[in-house]
Interface confidence: medium
């Protein structure tokens, strides 16, 4: 569909005569009839197959014709057509004299014709006006013409229909050849597919409008390139959705069991060395001068009772000093100037001469010790408490205060690792020398029976159209990650495609 446009420029009839040679009275009141038809090698009378148009009276004798000229006429003249433009045409332009106001053919005398021109040729669709001029013995007509397409028609022959749109069915404008040109942010054959946010993950993200990035189940982040770990995962990460891969030093189904208490909590004080010894269990090896489960207590150097023979100990900045009783000397009052004659043994100790009476030795009764039986026996000096237990004197006896995880008189027994029921999903726990072992029921595996194996919701391949299946361990259900173009809990529905368009 298009329009043949004819622009009349100038008509010259200097003598004001008709084609017969007869002059017009008082002058030739000139109007035009135009006939457009298919190409003929010799233009002949007959139907105006492409259309006809007439003008009102445009002037007298010689005159120039302006755009949208006065008198109600349209210039350029419009000859619309509703077919594919063939690229060739024939054109007949007749100039007539109107003696009165009635311009109908039957109302005019037969000799009212002033001039008649006929041309034929090639004409491509385009904006350019093609200039032409025809001269006869008495008249001259200058005009130009072109063919343009109607609104929404495009191409070399105005045969291609294209209507711009910006709605659910497409987002485009039309190019000069009728092809679609997508609006910014849209792509696809009919410009229906939004262009997602730059960098939006191809599989894990999608969009319903341009510059958007919506995440499929199991994915998160601005570009949908971060997986969502298992619900409740504390100290773990994932590489695919719903995983919980524990960070170093953590264990358990949700990576919430601390396997590296030393690093995470630094419990040992005063420069002590920390050793992990199980879940939330540790041992501190104290530096000299410190004691306590966490080496939090500072030892006085006199606490070890270094002064013998009843010597009294005095703490000093750089150590300690023994004040010896009469008859003793040395760093620890270990040397005696006494003999058995001086009755040096206390608390009922019996004296024995040595080195021909130059020295002696005391044999102490139970509960007393020291070179002169001057000290009550400290039952803790032998460090009887195992596994870092703390020894406490209780009168004539002693007792051990055990660290968590140990029991027994001397803290020599491990509290059963199985007491905490560490095996998940009904697993059976076995205490071992260095830890425990879980025997898992059918359908579970892993150190603590935390991994489901046989009950796999994805095993039945529930997802359609090449979707990726993920098992949600916490609910025994599956999640389908749909490829582009499919929706539904199992990706079973194709996204509705538009009806095909005629262009």
């Amino acid at each position: 569909s298009g329009v043949f446009q004819l622009q009349l420029q100038e008509f010259i009839n200097e003598r004001g005569v008709l084609a017969s040679g007869r002059p017009c009275e008082p002058g030739c009141r000139t109007f035009f009839r135009v006939c457009l038809k298919h190409f003929q090698a010799v233009v002949s009378p007959g139907p105006c197959t492409f259309g006809t148009v007439s003008t009102p009276v445009l002037g007298t004798n010689s005159f120039a014709v302006r755009d949208d000229s006065s008198g109600g006429g349209r210039n350029p003249l419009q000859l619309p057509f509703n077919f594919t433009w063939p690229g060739t045409f024939s054109l007949i332009i007749e100039a007539w004299h109107a003696p009165g106001d009635d311009l109908r053919p039957e109302a005019l005398p037969p000799d009212a014709l002033i001039s008649k021109i006929a041309i034929q040729g090639s004409l491509a669709v385009g904006q350019n006006w093609l200039l032409d001029e025809q001269t006869s013995t008495l008249t001259r007509l200058r005009y130009s013409y072109r063919v343009i397409c109607s609104d929404n028609y495009y191409g070399d022959n105005c045969s291609r229909l294209c209507k711009k749109r910006n709605d659910h069915f497409g987002h485009y404008v039309c190019q000069p050849d009728g092809n679609l040109s997508c609006l910014p942010g849209w792509t696809g054959e009919y410009c229906q597919q939004p262009i997602c946010l730059s960098g939006c993950h191809e599989q894990n993200g999608y969009c319903s409008k341009p510059a958007e990035c919506l995440c499929r189940p199991g994915w998160q982040g601005r570009l949908c390139n971060e997986c969502i770990p298992h619900n409740g995962c504390r100290h773990g990460t994932c590489s695919t959705p719903w995983q919980c891969t524990c960070d170093e030093g953590w264990g358990g189904l949700f990576c919430d069991q601390d396997l590296n208490y030393c690093t995470h909590h630094s419990p040992c004080k005063n420069g002590a060395t920390c050793s992990n010894s199980g879940q939330r269990s540790y041992t501190c090896t104290c530096r000299p001068g410190y004691t306590g489960v966490d080496c939090e207590l500072e030892l006085s150097e006199c606490d070890s009772n270094p002064c013998r023979n009843g010597g009294s100990c005095k703490d000093q900045e750089d150590g300690y000093h023994c004040l010896c009783p009469p008859g003793y000397y040395g760093l620890h009052c270990e040397h005696s100037t006494l003999s058995c004659a001086d009755s040096p043994c206390f608390n009922g100790g019996s004296c024995r001469e040595r080195n021909q009476g130059a020295n002696y030795a005391c044999e102490c009764p139970p509960n007393f010790t020291g070179s002169n039986c001057e000290k009550k026996v400290d039952r803790c000096t032998s460090n009887p408490c195992a596994n870092g237990g703390q020894c406490l004197n209780r009168g004539p006896s002693r007792m051990c205060r055990c660290r968590p995880g140990f029991t027994g008189t001397y803290c020599e027994l491990h509290v059963s690792d199985c007491a905490r029921n560490p095996c998940a999903h009904g697993g059976t726990c076995h205490d071992l020398e260095n830890g425990l072992m879980c025997t898992c029921p059918a359908g579970f595996s892993g150190r603590r029976c935390e991994v489901r194996t046989s009950i796999d919701a994805c095993a039945s391949s529930p997802c359609f159209n090449r979707a990726t299946c993920y098992t949600d361990l916490s609910t025994d259900t599956f999640v389908c990650n749909c490829p582009y173009g499919f929706v539904g809990s199992r990706c079973e529905f194709p996204v509705g495609l538009p009806p095909s368009f005629p262009w």
Epitope: A64, Q120, G121, L123, W129, L130, E133, R146
Partner: antibody
Amino acid sequence: EVQLVQSGAEVKKPGASVKVSCKASGYTFTSYTMHWVRQAPGQRLEWMGWINAGNGNTKYSQKFQGRVTITRDTFASTAYMELSSLRSEDTAVYYCARSRYNSGGSLVDYWGQGTLVTVSS
Amino acid sequence: QSVVTQPPSVSAAPGQKVTISCSGSSSNIENNYVSWYQQLPGTAPKLLIYDNNKRPSGIPDRFSGSKSGTSATLGITGLQTGDEADYYCGTWDSSLSAEVFGTGTKVTVL
């Protein structure tokens, strides 16, 4: 890209004829009018005539009427200008020029490179 | 005798402005569009201005055109040495039914 490529320089004797060609490309040949314009050494531009490439209709300047013939070959997209009865004052550069037309007159928008015609005995 | 006349020459220093007039009549300039062409030495003319005041793509805005009655004017601002050329106006003459060109103006950059 619109291009008009003309034939090479010619040397002619007085009384002879010369035919200059102008090959068009980069646009629809039949949708435009082709003008011919000449320029004698040190002189202004002088319009000679035009041809409607769609239907072959021609219009000539009164100064050259009877001596100039403009034709076209639509299949070769080429226009021709033939000038006969050459005289020494016809020595000039001859240009073909494409014309666009609108309601206010024609507009020469692209020119050939020119062809020098020398008329000398 | 030409129907459209121009001054033979104009000159100005670099960076200055020059104007070239084109004088005609009602049968040409007054009732038809005017075009301006630049012809550098030894080359074909090149379209500078069409439809009185429009510039084709690639022509800098230093070149401008205007029309009033039977006269048209070409203005060149920020004159450059590369602007040294002959400048012609062109229009349609209805009475001659012919394309007509002005007599041409040589622009010299001092």
